[in-house]
Interface confidence: low
């Protein structure tokens, strides 16, 4: 497994990570930590593991957290109700 660095699919990353689009270069994907409490997230980034190619630069939230809307277009990993 690729613990850090370039990847194509989640299976190439270590535990607690997913293969997300790089913030800096949209054409590449890098192993990225799963969303922690308070991290920004996208509500549809839920598939873990995901067998295709992710389109967002955020990973799903860690287990026990949910990606919840806090304002019009802002979503954050928060404790599940």
């Amino acid at each position: 497994a690729v613990i850090t660095g370039a990847c194509d699919k989640d299976s190439q990353c270590g535990g607690g990570m997913c293969c997300a689009v790089s913030i800096w270069v949209k054409s590449i994907r890098i192993c990225t930590p799963m969303g922690k409490l308070g991290d920004s997230c996208h509500p549809l980034t839920r598939k873990v593991p995901f067998f295709g190619r992710r389109m967002h630069h955020t990973c799903p939230c860690l287990p026990g957290l949910a990606c919840l809307r806090t304002s019009f277009n802002r979503f954050i990993c928060l404790a599940q109700k």
Epitope: P49, F51, R54, H56
Partner: antibody
Framework: EVQLVQSGAEVKKPGASVKVSCKAS????????MHWVRQAPGQGLEWIGY????????TYNQKFKGRVTITVDKSTSTAYLELSSLRSEDTAVYYC??????????????WGQGTLVTVSS | DIVMTQSPDSLAVSLGERATINCKAS??????????MNWYQQKPGQPPKLLIY???NLESGVPDRFSGSGSGTDFTLTISSLQAEDVAVYYC?????????FGQGTKVEIK
């Protein structure tokens, strides 16, 4: 060749439940999510929910919350939709549809042939 | 829920002419530079068929006379040269926020 084969038409009484099956073949079943969509006679499309065929995680349209259950049987590569407390407005063709794995751009690339569920007293 | 409104409800176009279908979302379906909009074609008695995903990506095997464009709340499906086999109902669908919602459909016929 990817195929989704659904169970046959059903006629149910109001208040009853129905369970529709969708047997997948021609691909690795657990690598793709499965959606369910319905279409009332002469009407448009309505998304019901989807399931991860890998871990069974579900997301439902809140409109159906409490009445709908989507499950999978990995051993037979089959997805199921169960809808309870049926009413006349649930009369529709119910489709299963595979998610195409386009990242988070959910898109349904293969569809079952549809199952007509008629709710009538 | 995000409401998708298509226009027109029906459209009659001559063979070989351009057909344009519009879809307006009640709020933006963009995120991080991508537009989360799909287009499907449905012929009578058949299930829908995916044409375009993520606003402008042509599904494999779909003729290149079909194209999708737009961002934010306004999207367009264009058939550059209508063929007889394109007679169908076309649906847009947003997939930016669940529940994933469809437009009411646009029926395309031959003039």
């Amino acid at each position: 060749e990817v195929q989704l084969v659904q169970s046959g038409a059903e006629v149910k009484k109001p208040g009853a439940s129905v369970k529709v099956s969708c047997k997948a073949s021609g691909y690795s079943f657990t690598d793709y999510d499965m959606h369910w969509v319905r279409q009332a006679p002469g009407q448009g499309l309505e998304w019901i929910g989807y399931i991860s065929c890998y871990n069974g995680a579900t997301t439902y349209n809140q409109k159906f919350k409490g009445r709908v259950t989507i499950t999978v049987d990995k051993s037979t590569s089959t997805a199921y939709l169960e809808l309870s407390s049926l009413r006349s407005e649930d009369t529709a063709v119910y489709y299963c549809a595979r998610d195409g794995n386009y990242g988070e751009a959910y898109a349904m690339d293969y569809w079952g042939q549809g199952t007509l569920v008629t709710v009538s007293s | 829920d995000i409401v998708m409104t298509q226009s027109p409800d029906s459209l009659a176009v001559s063979l070989g002419e351009r057909a344009t279908i519009n879809c307006k979302a009640s709020q933006s379906v963009d995120y991080d530079g991508d537009s989360y909009m799909n287009w499907y074609q449905q012929k009578p008695g058949q299930p829908p068929k995916l044409l375009i995903y993520a606003a402008s990506n042509l599904e494999s095997g779909v003729p290149d006379r079909f194209s999708g464009s737009g961002s934010g709340t306004d999207f367009t499906l264009t058939i550059s040269s209508l063929q007889a086999e394109d007679v169908a109902v076309y649906y847009c669908q947003q997939i930016n926020e669940d529940p994933f919602t469809f437009g009411q459909g646009t029926k395309v016929e031959i003039k």
